[in-house]
Interface confidence: low
């Protein structure tokens, strides 16, 4: 639903004559009749399918027409329609002379016509006025026109109905294209869903109005992200509702029994670590150099002879240190210096001597690593699969399982929409991010180049004197629609002035 608006601006009839050439007595009291109809290649008489409107007498001979829209007047002229605007139209504007006050068609003499213009074309819905001027031999009419949507109608064709609302059924206003625009704090297809307080837990919280966060049973806190523990839980917490997981040092069903002997009695000496091991029981883990139940006894760490293979032990402040004899190394001199003769490489690794046999290096087969080829390689650790592909270890190799729309060894290739050769008649296919596009060769059009196009007989501009050219598809010939004052198959001949003119 919408309105075709026509704004008459200026009418010039300097000589004050009718279309017949006869002068008006005393002057041409001019009013207009407007006919709006569907697009016709050649505008012809017949029903005004989109509507008609008439004006009162607006002036005599030549005059400017005042813009009356602000005062509730009738300029611009309104031609409402209750259908989808087709994007094309035909418009006939007739200027008539009113000898008396009765402007009805039947009350006027047939020769009271001053001038008649007919235009047709495309017109998109929009706020901008299209300015036009039509000149005949004796008159000139300047006017502008546009199509706008009625209230609550939107879109390119005024076909989209949208009424703003803010109630139980929705909270939105309408965008220029007719789509809904949710009011602040609302979301969803019809803006019925409130947007809860930012951070409100998705599962454990909900809201009935914007910026609210109501907790479901078992949950608490401003964002409903804290569980409620079992009723009576003293020194415990929960990860799901109604649990009572005891804090360290507490036990029992309600975490009300003190198990933290360590904290309350500090039994371990010399910086030992105390661990509670039940109600009123504990264990002390001694620092190096100490022993005893409470680590109260000092000892030399070298007393246990920790150094092997003839290594000598040295006491140190924070432990001990082994001095190893030649050929051995390690914390306790437990490792011997190996050579390739000792076959140190596992899993089929080959041994290469280095530094004149003093040490060696292992060259590992595929799928193994480590200084002695003792570790199996996980080929998926480097995330080799692109575009969200899933990496699968397959024996000695790996493979990528690709998501839909991707292919290639590493899912690096997009599956082309053009692979199906969708463009007909030799059209060139272009992959786009969300579809494809066909570039058609000469002689074709359409989304898939499926439409064959004929050569336009009007292409050579055969009509003269600003006449409009139309192609007859069946015979492939052209027809010229002549402007007022010209005749001929190409509108090449001016019409001679009528002999009854007084000048």
């Amino acid at each position: 639903s919408g309105v075709f608006q026509l704004q008459l601006q200026e009418f010039i009839n300097e000589r004050g004559v009718l279309a017949s050439g006869r002068p008006c007595e005393p002057g041409c009291r001019t009013f207009f009749r407007v006919c709006l109809k569907h697009f016709q290649a050649v505008v012809s008489p017949g029903p005004c399918t989109f509507g008609t409107v008439s004006t009162p007498v607006l002036g005599t001979n030549s005059f400017a027409v005042r813009d009356d829209s602000s005062g509730g007047g009738r300029n611009p002229l309104q031609l409402p329609f209750n259908f989808t605007w087709p994007g094309t139209f035909s418009l006939i504007i007739e200027a008539w002379h009113a000898p008396g006050d009765d402007l009805r068609p039947e009350a006027l003499p047939p020769d009271a016509l001053i001038s008649k213009i007919a235009i047709q074309g495309s017109l998109a819905v929009g706020q901008n006025w299209l300015l036009d001027e039509q000149t005949s031999t004796l008159t000139r009419l300047r006017y502008s026109y546009r199509v706008i949507c009625s209230d609550n109608y939107y879109g390119d064709n005024c076909s989209r109905l949208c009424k703003k609302r803010n109630d139980h059924f929705g909270h939105y206003v309408c965008q220029p294209d007719g789509n809904l625009s949710c009011l602040p704090g609302w979301t969803g297809e019809y803006c019925q869903q409130p947007i809860c307080l930012s951070g409100c837990h998705e599962q454990n919280g909900y809201c009935s109005k914007p910026a609210e966060c109501l907790c479901r049973p078992g949950w608490q806190g401003r964002l409903c992200n804290e569980c409620i523990p079992h009723n009576g839980c003293r020194h415990g917490t929960c990860s799901t509702p109604w649990q009572c997981t005891c804090d360290e040092g507490w036990g029992g069903l309600f975490c009300d029994q003190d198990l933290n002997y360590c904290t309350h009695h500090s039994p371990c000496k010399n910086g030992a670590t105390c661990s509670n091991s039940g109600q009123r029981s504990y264990t002390c883990t001694c620092r190096p150099g100490y022993t005893g139940v409470d680590c109260e006894l000092e000892l030399s760490e070298c007393d246990s002879n920790p150094c092997r293979n003839g290594g000598s032990c040295k006491d140190q402040e924070d432990g001990y240190h082994c001095l190893c004899p030649p050929g051995y190394y390690g914390l306790h001199c437990e490792h011997s210096t190996l050579s390739c003769a000792d076959s140190p490489c596992f899993n089929g690794g080959s041994c290469r001597e280095r530094n004149q046999g003093a040490n060696y290096a292992c060259e590992c087969p595929p799928n193994f690593t480590g200084s002695n080829c003792e570790k199996k390689v996980d080929r998926c650790t480097s995330n080799p699969c692109a575009n969200g592909g899933q990496c699968l270890n397959r024996g000695p190799s790996r493979m990528c399982r690709c998501r839909p729309g991707f292919t290639g060894t590493y899912c690096e290739l997009h599956v082309s929409d053009c692979a199906r050769n969708p463009c007909a008649h030799g059209g060139t296919c272009h992959d786009l991010e969300n579809g494809l596009m066909c570039t058609c060769p000469a002689g074709f059009s359409g989304r898939r180049c499926e439409v064959r196009t004929s050569i336009d007989a009007c292409a050579s501009s055969p009509c003269f004197n600003r006449a409009t050219c139309y192609t007859d598809l069946s015979t492939d010939t052209f027809v010229c629609n002549c402007p007022y004052g010209f005749v001929g198959s190409r509108c090449e001949f001016p019409v001679g002035l009528p002999p009854s003119f007084p000048w």
């Epitope: 004929s454 050569i455 492939d476």
Partner: antibody, heavy 119, light 106 residues
Framework: EVQLVESGGGVVQPGGSLRLSCAAS????????MSWVRQAPGKGLEWVAD????????YYADSVKGRFTISRDNSKNTLYLQLNSLRAEDTAVYYC????????????WGQGTMVTVSS | SYELTQPPSVSVSPGQTASITCSAD??????VSWYQQKPGQSPVLVIY???MRPSGIPERFSGSNSGNTATLTISGTQAMDEADYYC?????????FGGGTKLTVL
């Protein structure tokens, strides 16, 4: 008057050849796609081949591909169909038709010429 | 390949409305033309682009096309409308005709 007139039909043995012609008048021949459509006795219509206005694009039904050739001479306002390796199932009335622009179907048809393939 | 399916025959009394259907998968995405062919004559285009009438074709011929079905409707059928009717559409492989429907005016 817009008119298409076919000629060149006749009786031919299997494996033989024929050349059909279609003379156009009453419209700008060089501006339009042209087609051949055939109709076997007592059967329905079957599209045979299409050719673009300038002769660059040619399309054939699978049943005649590789055996028939469509061509045109815009200077003579004439459409041709060369029929080779003819088979009994090619027996039909062959119509020449003007294809309207923009998928509007075949708006002008000739009177047809009969091709009979028989030993 | 694309196949257009038509009923072999349709009967109608004079003055009544005759409907001839033509079906194929997603036919509504294609333009459909309709042809009338009387015995011993060449076909004549009666409807193009689903529902457009060429000049000279009576207003009682109309067409529609949506979904999987195109329909040729002849309102106020006359004896002279008795003929074979063919639907036709464009497909990637070329032009395709339906098998034809014989319209009998009783």
């Amino acid at each position: 008057e817009v008119q298409l007139v076919e000629s060149g039909g006749g009786v031919v043995q299997p494996g033989g050849s024929l050349r059909l012609s279609c003379a156009a008048s009453g419209f700008t021949f060089g501006n339009h796609w042209m087609s051949w459509v055939r109709q076997a006795p007592g059967k329905g219509l079957e599209w045979v081949a299409d050719i673009s206005s300038d002769g660059r694009y040619k399309y054939y039904a699978d049943s005649v591909k590789g055996r028939f050739t469509i061509s045109r001479d815009n200077s003579k306002n004439t459409l041709y169909l060369q029929l080779n390796s003819l088979r009994a199932e090619d027996t039909a009335v062959y119509y020449c038709a003007k294809a309207g622009g923009g998928n509007v179907g075949f708006d002008i048809w000739g009177q047809g010429t009969m091709v009979t393939v028989s030993s | 390949s694309y196949e257009l399916t038509q009923p072999p025959s349709v009967s109608v009394s004079p003055g009544q409305t005759a409907s001839i259907t033509c079906s194929a998968d997603n036919l509504g995405n294609q333009y459909v033309s309709w042809y009338q062919q009387k015995p011993g004559q060449s076909p004549v285009l009666v409807i193009y682009q689903d529902g457009m009438r060429p000049s000279g074709i009576p207003e009682r011929f109309s067409g529609s096309n949506s979904g999987n079905t195109a329909t040729l409707t002849i309102s106020g059928t006359q004896a002279m409308d008795e003929a074979d009717y063919y639907c036709q559409a464009w497909d990637w492989s070329g032009e395709v005709f339906g098998g034809g429907t014989k319209l009998t005016v009783l």
